[in-house]
């Protein structure tokens, strides 16, 4: 399975995409910016299989689509833009589903990492949280967009290691 | 290792222009804005403007709207300060520094180690 | 524009002294405050950022409080090395703002 190749492609395209998304200047929203808390170690360690890794990237990219699949999202940006982008996440998805039906015959340990999982799950709870209390304004939006472009970014250094290791 | 170099120290007339840069390494260079710092000798720091490498999208101090122009070229990682006419009083020290943006993160945590311009007739 | 006034504009003080200095902004900026150490001839330095956050690699003898308009910087056991002009910078919208700094000076 070469997941981490293709990933990483479609990887960049979801960057290209999220970052042609802007509709407003990000400078007049300074004041909007918040600390998330990317759970960064969930992608720092190197003790995962490599299925436990890909179940954790799954969860981001699952997690991102269905941020972007709402209708305040539908509402907010370019529907040309946003379909292409989940496209992509949705192709990324499937890819990832198959890679990890492939490596668990080929993998002794458990097929999901549930620590890292639910540190995902609930670093989207948190930005779906402040999108709420922000009521879903332009600002917020904007803060959101460049907060999944960084963890898709940090992500990215991720896959890489993970390639290294294969 | 972040980076970020200056070019080296200008002497000009009034009346001249001159563009300095800043070019960025050891990081995804259109992931953070860079923004501009003036010292005038003796004195504090005054903000000048700032740019967002990904797209050129800018934003300046009153201080400094119509006095300078902040560009970039994110395919050589450089931002770039120019003057179409310099004066006496432009003469100071240019710091450039990186700025995370929207993203929660230090704010200008790396800076370049400054360019001296000095304009004097 | 937001202004942001310090003090003092100096002081003086002996290695280990605990040194406060304090900055004021001219309306709420929330945490979004920022200060920086600067030596001649130098660039300057992050020392903290959102107002109480230890910007990585600086050491644990700085810290930073204060939220809305009255921030500090306290430097709790002065070192030979802190001899240096301090200055805070609002960050919560542009134009960005820095303090007049604060000169910290060997008594």
């Known amino acids: 399975c070469d997941l981490p190749q293709t990933h990483s492609l479609g990887n960049r395209r979801a960057l290209i995409l999220l970052a042609q998304m802007g509709r407003i200047s990000p400078f007049s929203c300074l004041k909007d910016r918040h600390d998330f808390g990317f759970p960064q170690e969930e992608f720092d360690g190197n003790q995962f299989q490599k299925a436990q890794a890909i179940s954790v990237l799954h969860e981001m990219i699952q997690q991102t689509f269905n941020l972007f699949s709402t209708k305040d999202s539908s509402a907010t940006w370019e529907q040309s833009l946003l379909e292409k982008f989940s496209t992509e996440l949705n192709q990324q998805l499937n890819d990832m589903e198959a890679c990890v039906i492939q490596e668990v015959g080929v993998e002794e340990t458990p097929l999901m990492n549930v620590d890292s999982i639910l540190a995902v799950k609930k670093y989207f709870q948190r930005i779906t949280l402040y999108l709420t209390e922000k009521k879903y304004s332009p600002c917020a939006w904007e803060v959101v967009r460049a907060e999944i472009m960084r963890s898709f970014s940090l992500s990215k250094i991720f896959q890489e290691r993970l390639r290294r290791k294969e | 290792e972040v980076q970020l170099v200056q070019s080296g120290a200008e002497v000009k007339k009034p009346g001249e222009s001159l563009k300095i840069s800043c070019k960025g390494s050891g990081y995804s260079f259109t992931s953070y804005w860079i923004g501009w710092v003036r010292q005038m000798p003796g004195k504090g720091l005054e903000w000048m403007g700032i740019i967002d490498p990904s797209d050129s999208d800018t934003a300046y101090s009153p201080s400094f709207q119509g006095q300078v122009t902040i560009s970039a070229d994110k395919s050589i990682s450089t931002a770039y300060l120019q003057w179409s006419s310099l004066k006496a009083s432009d003469t100071a020290m240019y710091y450039c520094?990186?700025?995370?943006?929207?993203?929660?993160?230090?704010?200008?945590?790396?800076w370049g180690q400054g360019t001296l311009v000095t304009v004097s007739s | 524009d937001i202004q942001m006034t310090q003090s003092p504009s100096s002081l003086s003080a002996s290695v280990g002294d605990r040194v406060t200095i304090t900055c004021r902004a001219s309306?709420?900026?929330?945490?979004?405050l920022n200060w920086y150490q600067q030596k001649p001839g130098k660039a300057p330095k992050l020392l903290i950022y959102a107002a109480s956050s230890l910007q990585s690699g600086v050491p644990s003898r700085f810290s930073g409080s204060g939220s809305g308009t009255d921030f500090t910087l306290t430097i709790s056991s002065l070192q030979p090395e802190d001899f240096a002009t301090y200055y805070c910078q609002q960050a919560i919208d542009l134009p960005f703002t820095f303090g007049q700094g604060t000169k910290v000076e060997i008594k």
């Open positions: 309306q709420s900026i929330n945490r979004f």
């Open positions: 520094a990186r700025h995370p943006g929207l993203n929660w993160a230090p704010d200008f945590d790396y």
